[in-house]
């Protein structure tokens, strides 16, 4: 004969848990249903009835199976710096990520609770650390021989132009001017735009540091953001 | 849904101590109030501590409060039972189990939970 399939509820055996999308309720001590992801428990089981469920209402979700008496609220509207990636709807939360040239200084559950601007190295800087979704650009001087003379969040410092002859030397935030004879670039490696980070809903994952001689100033809550950095503007 | 593995159980002397820990995978950890529960030979199922949902609250036993700490490490999906000054009626096979979005302690039911780890104090 085949062993009979019990029904919920029904009182466990000794030792044994319940069964896939069930639990065992403390005050009922048998094994009820769970609610469906979207669902909530509107009556809870008792010895001899199972539980009860009911959809979530406008702006509540549940995303796991679960017998929770009240869905959550899902999370207010993504701030004018985010995008919302994920809408609110009965089976998930809103999720809101940082727009283009702005990082999450502040992470919550998913998402991002509180973005920030990327940092822009001024000319004389360039950029030593691209920003990523959860950190910010690291700005570094420009060494001899290079320079940058553009206030961004994704230049580095490029070689200096090497002239036949040198009409004015370049420095940290100028290129070398030429005379008219043509002038040779240096073949130093580089000269290229970092791209901006893209906000995406995939783990966010912590850069790997790279030594630099200009510090990375952070933001200290609940204050406001902290004065620019060596190098940095908040432009 | 989640799957737990307990780990760290073992023979101690009185006045010892141990630490427990639950590795959760299938879904994120912090989505659940979590509770450690133990079993003596011929006894009820007790809970033992508790942790919410939020993490804005923790529930001892009396019977062990200021010697167990609960913890968790939502980064590491992993949660802890530190245990100290045991005594031999703390001999139990300990579980540990959830409750999603569970807002109060102790848990009003159980979700899934581990095989267990057996805890023995003897001298």
């Known amino acids: 004969l085949p062993a009979q399939v019990a029904f919920t509820p029904y009182a466990p055996e000794p030792g044994s848990t319940c069964r896939l999308r069930e639990y065992y309720d403390q005050t009922a001590q048998m094994c009820c249903s769970k609610c469906s992801p979207g669902q909530h428990a509107k009556v809870f089981c008792t010895k001899t009835s199972d539980t009860v469920c009911d959809s979530c209402e406008d702006s509540t979700y549940t995303q796991l199976w679960n017998w929770v008496p009240e869905c959550l609220s899902c999370g207010s509207r993504c701030s004018s710096d985010q995008v919302e990636t994920q809408a609110c709807t009965r089976e998930q939360n809103r999720i809101c990520t940082c727009r283009p040239g702005w990082y999450c200084a502040l992470s919550k559950q998913e998402g991002c609770r509180l973005c920030a601007p990327l940092r822009k190295c001024r000319p004389g800087f360039g950029v030593a650390r691209p920003g990523t979704e959860t950190s910010d650009v690291v700005c570094k001087p420009c060494a001899p021989g290079t320079f940058s003379n553009t206030t961004s969040s994704t230049d580095i410092c490029r070689p200096h132009q090497i002239c036949n002859v040198v009409a004015i030397p370049g420095n940290a935030s100028m290129d070398a001017v030429c005379t008219s004879t043509s002038p040779t670039r240096s073949m130093a490696p580089g000269a290229v735009h970092l791209p901006q980070p893209v906000s995406t809903r995939s783990q966010h994952t912590q850069p790997t540091p790279e030594p630099s001689t200009a510090p990375s100033t952070s933001f200290l809550l609940p204050m406001g953001p902290s004065p620019p950095a060596e190098g940095s503007t908040g432009d | 849904e989640v799957q737990l593995v307990e780990s760290g159980g073992g023979l101690v002397q009185p006045g010892g101590s141990l630490r427990l820990s639950c590795a959760a995978s299938?879904?994120?950890?912090?989505?659940?109030?979590v509770a450690w529960v133990r079993q003596a030979p011929g006894k009820e199922l007790e809970e033992v501590s508790c942790?919410?949902?939020?993490?804005?609250?923790?529930n001892y036993a009396e019977s062990v409060k200021g010697r167990f700490t609960i913890s968790r490490d939502n980064s590491k999906n992993t949660l802890y039972l530190q245990m100290n000054s045991l005594r031999a009626e703390d001999t139990a096979v300990y579980y540990c189990t959830t409750e999603p979005y569970g807002s109060s302690c102790p848990l009003s039911g159980y979700d899934t939970w581990g095989q267990g780890t057996l805890v023995t104090v003897s001298s």
């Open positions: 299938g879904s994120r950890l912090d989505y659940y109030a």
């Open positions: 942790i919410t949902y939020s993490g804005g609250s923790t």
